[in-house]
Interface confidence: medium
Amino acid sequence: HKSSSQGQDRHMIRMRQLIDIVDQLKNYVNDLVPEFLPAPEDVETNCEWSAFSCFQKAQLKSANTGNNERIINVSIKKLKRKPPSTNAGRRQKHRLTCPSCDSYEKKPPKEFLERFKSLLQKMIHQHLSSRTHGSEDS
């Protein structure tokens, strides 16, 4: 279905951009508030979207030091932008069995960003394999 596949592509491009933004932020890790943030790891299958929302809700902040503050704030804002939803995302929203954000181990910004990237990669790979098998549900 044309419009569905177009939506899927849009979703993939946004997810792909998020990986680049995380990579960019990692270069400014010393300019981030060194606060410990919930950082999901080894996320249970079907809880990826729940974990993704935990990363988005986390209070990642610029330390307001120097010239990088504006670009860091812009990128954090972009990280929080909601990607186009997929069937899987809609389905997972209704699951009540996923861990709460507070239950995940808290990590400093560097590890937080590494784990976020890892989850994004997992979600992209799942998405690609689901498309290969003719499904738009994961």
């Epitope: 177009q6 680049d20 990692k26 972009k78």
Partner: antibody, heavy 120, light 107 residues
């Protein structure tokens, strides 16, 4: 200064191969998605391929799929395009292009281009 | 693939004129569109990203608007250095595609 410099273009016979390189400087190369865009003589722009910052996600135009391979070496600040089974219609100026960062849509840094001519 | 149709294909105008170039997408592309300027023998240069955001260093006489399927690039008062070819490009889905270009010539 933010800069992209392409090399590797030249004259090749149909069915032959070429490897284009792009040297990046003046920015954190490993943070950006990169693209190849081409322009045939007297024609418009055609997107060829893209690769994400960590090489996790790659796409090709249908016209080059199965023949061209994009890759990057972040340690060397370099982008590559391996072109095999070249055809006359691949004759073009090939641009190495940085995709605009921080989640925005656009290609903000372009190299000067390298010319590929496929002819017998 | 999403097709982008630019109009007009060519345009003659004078210094000081207000010029509008349109780009129509075959499907909804949200605001995932950029505009470029290219002069003969040179690489393209980005003018507008995200449909309406002016790229840093680009003169304010350039502006972009639109969302969905219809987009416009406007030059409020043409300068001699603006005579060039202009392209739109979509980033909504693969393959990324460009419009066929609009050549802006001196009248």
């Amino acid at each position: 200064e933010v800069q992209l410099v392409e090399s590797g273009g030249g004259l090749v016979k149909p069915g032959g191969s070429l490897r284009l390189s792009c040297a990046a400087s003046g920015f954190i190369f490993s943070s950006y998605s990169m693209n190849w865009v081409r322009q045939a003589p007297g024609k418009g722009l055609e997107w060829v391929s893209s690769i994400t910052s960590g090489s996790y996600y790659i796409h090709y135009a249908d016209s080059v799929k199965g023949r061209f391979t994009i890759s990057r070496d972040n340690a060397k600040n370099s982008l590559y395009l391996q072109m095999n089974s070249l055809r006359a219609e691949d004759t073009a100026v090939y641009y190495c292009v940085r995709e605009r960062g921080w989640g925005y849509y656009g290609m903000d840094v372009w190299g000067q281009g390298t010319t590929v001519t496929v002819s017998s | 693939a999403i097709q982008l149709t630019q109009s007009p294909s060519s345009l003659s105008a004078s210094v000081g004129d207000r010029v509008t170039i349109t780009c129509r997408a075959s499907q909804d592309i949200d605001s995932a569109l950029a505009w470029y300027q290219q002069k003969p023998g040179k690489a393209p240069k980005i003018l507008i990203h995200d449909a309406s955001s002016l790229e840093s260093g680009v003169p304010s006489r350039f502006s972009g608007s639109g969302s969905g399927t219809d987009f416009t690039l406007t030059i409020s008062s043409l300068q001699p250095e603006d005579f060039a070819t202009y392209y739109c490009q979509q980033f909504n889905s693969y393959p990324y595609t460009f419009g066929q270009g609009t050549k802006l010539e001196i009248k």
